[in-house]
């Protein structure tokens, strides 16, 4: 059975294709190739006579065809018009003709695509954006990439127009991209340059830093306000409701107690038209805004019950503070045997009982701050008494 095979079947425009012939009969007068699915003298590409070992170009010969003695046909510099069927007619010595038809498909070498957008500055949670991959070409597959990843499954992402258009419904600030489109056909692939979205959003609720509330008189008050926003927010400050200045940072040197009050940061995005405010209370006081961690010491940590006493001391360098004691999360003193002295810096237990064993800690505090010591463990031992009858008491 005479057959033909296209090598390759899918050909890039400008390249070459070889129509290979299989099972060519032995005793031949010659053969001819025709464009199309049937023998048509007007569409003859080439004829070859065995007797002259010479080929003759036909009316459909473009000068790009080369026939080989084995009847194979090479077509060079193919165009998309060359796509289609080709028929080989073999004239045998017995004057019986045999025919075989093959085909190939010519695809263009794809250009570098580009992305067009209907809105390059969308507003968050409000606008949709449609990206279109250009150019539109036949027999082409369109693919999209976001952040170098294939498209995630999302109800906000829609493909249309044969995947040539990617629509983002209700964009968010995380949709900036980059976005790339890729076009593919059986012979080539090409990817666009990346495109990023400038998503307009915000401002979010501003944050005032630092987070400190308490300041000493004479200190410098330096507050900074930040709200996530695109374009960047415009800031203004109010103190106790009175406008101060339109800056991101507020600086007041050498503050006094009179500078205590509510500090408001106002953030505005002129594009979205949205405003957000945050209020922070500032207290200027002599009191230490941060109380240092106190140290706890014991006259001894292992004592004999009903016999020994123990003194626990809470040490701090801070002034204007108060001290309180805790034992097993309970406030002390909790019995007649416990006494506080020296402004509560010392806790005395006399005598120590079995139930006094456990964890003790102290806490120093002022009206605006407090801090706890590390815990200390008190162990209470009893001298072993001989058992008289092996029965437990009571």
């Amino acid at each position: 059975q005479l057959t033909t095979e296209s090598m390759p079947f899918n050909v890039a425009e400008g390249k070459e294709v070889l129509l290979l012939v299989h099972n060519l009969p032995q005793q031949l007068f010659g053969y001819s190739w025709y464009k199309g699915e049937r023998v048509d003298g007007n569409r003859q590409i080439v004829g070859y006579a065995i007797g002259t070992q010479q080929a003759t170009p036909g009316p459909a010969n473009s000068g790009r065809e080369t026939i080989y003695p084995n009847a194979s046909l090479l077509i060079q510099n193919v165009t998309q018009n060359d796509t289609g069927f080709y028929t080989l007619q073999v004239i045998k010595s017995d004057l019986v003709n045999e025919e075989a038809t093959g085909q190939f498909h010519v695809y263009p070498e794809l250009p570098k695509p580009s992305i067009s957008s209907n809105n390059s500055n969308p507003v968050e949670d409000k606008d949709a954006v449609a990206f279109t991959c250009e150019p539109e070409t036949q027999d082409t597959t369109y693919l999209w990439w976001i952040n170098n990843q294939s498209l995630p499954v999302s109800p906000r992402l829609q493909l249309s127009n044969g995947n040539r258009t990617l629509t983002l419904l209700s964009v968010t600030r995380n949709d900036t991209g980059p976005y790339e489109c890729e076009i593919q056909n059986p012979v080539s692939a090409n990817r666009s340059d990346p495109v990023t979205l400038n998503v307009t959003y915000g401002p979010d609720t501003p944050t005032i830093s630092p987070s400190d509330t308490y300041y000493r008189p004479g200190a410098n008050l330096s507050l900074s306000c930040y709200a996530a926003s695109n374009p960047p927010a415009q800031y203004s400050w109010l103190i106790n409701g009175t406008f101060q200045q339109s800056t991101q940072e507020l600086f007041i040197p050498n503050i006094t107690v009179n500078n205590s009050g509510s500090y408001t940061c106002h953030a505005n995005n002129s594009v979205t038209g949205c405003n957000r405010t945050t209020v922070k209370t500032i207290i200027v006081t002599e009191l230490s805004p941060v109380v240092a961690k106190p140290q706890i010491k014991a006259s001894k940590t292992t004592v004999t019950g009903d016999k020994d006493s123990v003194n626990l001391t809470c040490s701090t360098n801070d002034t204007g503070i108060s001290i309180r004691w805790f034992f097993k999360n309970q406030s002390l003193p909790s019995s007649e045997r416990m006494k506080l002295s020296q402004g509560n810096t010392t806790l005395s237990i006399n005598p120590v009982k079995r139930e006094d064993a456990g964890t003790y800690w102290c806490e120093v505090f002022n009206p605006i701050s407090k801090n706890q010591s590390d815990p200390i463990m008190l162990n209470v031992n009893y001298n072993a008494l001989p058992q008289e009858n092996g029965l437990s008491p009571g």
Epitope: Y48, I50, G51, T52, Q53, Q54, A55, T56, P57, G58, P59, N61, G63, T66, I67, Y68, P69, N70
Partner: antibody, heavy 118, light 113 residues
Framework: QVQLVQSGSELKKPGASVKVSCKAS????????MNWVRQAPGQGLQWMGW????????TYAQGFTGRFVFSLDTSVSTAYLQISSLKTEDTAVYYC???????????WGQGTLVTVSS | DIVMTQSPDSLAVSLGERATINCKPS????????????LAWYQQKPGQPPKLLIH???TRESGVPDRFSGSGSGTDFTLTISSLQAEDVAVYYC?????????FGQGTKLEIK
């Protein structure tokens, strides 16, 4: 690459015979016809004829019948030109040239000088 | 039989100048069904075999410098060397392969003036 290599120069006496060989490489000998061309000293090119390398059938141009024989040995990819009863006017360079599939001649052998002198 | 007539028999041209050689077949070598002229041009340098330059009357063989060009149709053909180089000194032959016997022109010897 496609190449035709011919045998070396020959000096013959009138009446003798000569056999010029043309070895083909870089392709299958039987796929393309082989032409023979004569160039007498200081003269132009004269087509002597060709041999169908597929069938072995020779075709001789006018004036090259009788004493001239084209033959093949496909086992060694070689075509031959044999001239018998040599005459002094047979002194020439003899070229083999592959018949391209469309009919022109390409490539050519380097030529074999046959000198017939008493 | 088709007789090929070349003119001139010899030609002297200055380096860098244009050289033109004509060839006239005694009958048309244009095959009407495919509109192809069955004519080739060859270059033969001294001591060398001929080398194919042009086929189908105007199609330059690969590797042939583009200063060589062929033109014409039917019974009137021209080989042109647009800017003669020293290495172009040779004898040039036209040949028809339209019919058997194929035939060559008598040759044109090209020299430098």
């Amino acid at each position: 690459q496609v190449q035709l290599v011919q045998s070396g120069s020959e000096l013959k006496k009138p009446g003798a015979s000569v056999k010029v060989s043309c070895k083909a490489s870089g392709y299958t000998l039987t796929d393309y016809g082989m032409n023979w061309v004569r160039q007498a000293p200081g003269q132009g090119l004269q087509w002597m004829g060709w041999i169908n390398t597929n069938t072995g059938n020779p075709t001789y141009a006018q004036g090259f019948t009788g004493r001239f024989v084209f033959s093949l040995d496909t086992s060694v990819s070689t075509a031959y030109l044999q001239i018998s009863s040599l005459k002094t006017e047979d002194t020439a360079v003899y070229y083999c040239a592959r018949k391209a599939i469309w009919g022109w001649f390409d490539p050519w052998g380097q030529g074999t000088l046959v000198t017939v002198s008493s | 039989d088709i007789v090929m007539t070349q003119s001139p028999d010899s030609l002297a041209v200055s380096l860098g100048e244009r050289a033109t050689i004509n060839c006239k077949p005694s009958q048309s070598v244009l095959y009407r069904s495919n509109n192809k002229n069955y004519l080739a041009w060859y270059q033969q340098k001294p001591g060398q075999p001929p080398k194919l330059l042009i086929h189908w009357a105007s199609t330059r063989e690969s590797g042939v410098p583009d200063r060589f060009s062929g033109s014409g149709s039917g019974t009137d053909f021209t080989l042109t060397i647009s800017s003669l180089q020293a290495e172009d000194v040779a004898v040039y032959y036209c040949q028809q392969y339209y019919s058997t016997p194929c035939s060559f022109g008598q040759g044109t010897k090209l020299e430098i003036k």
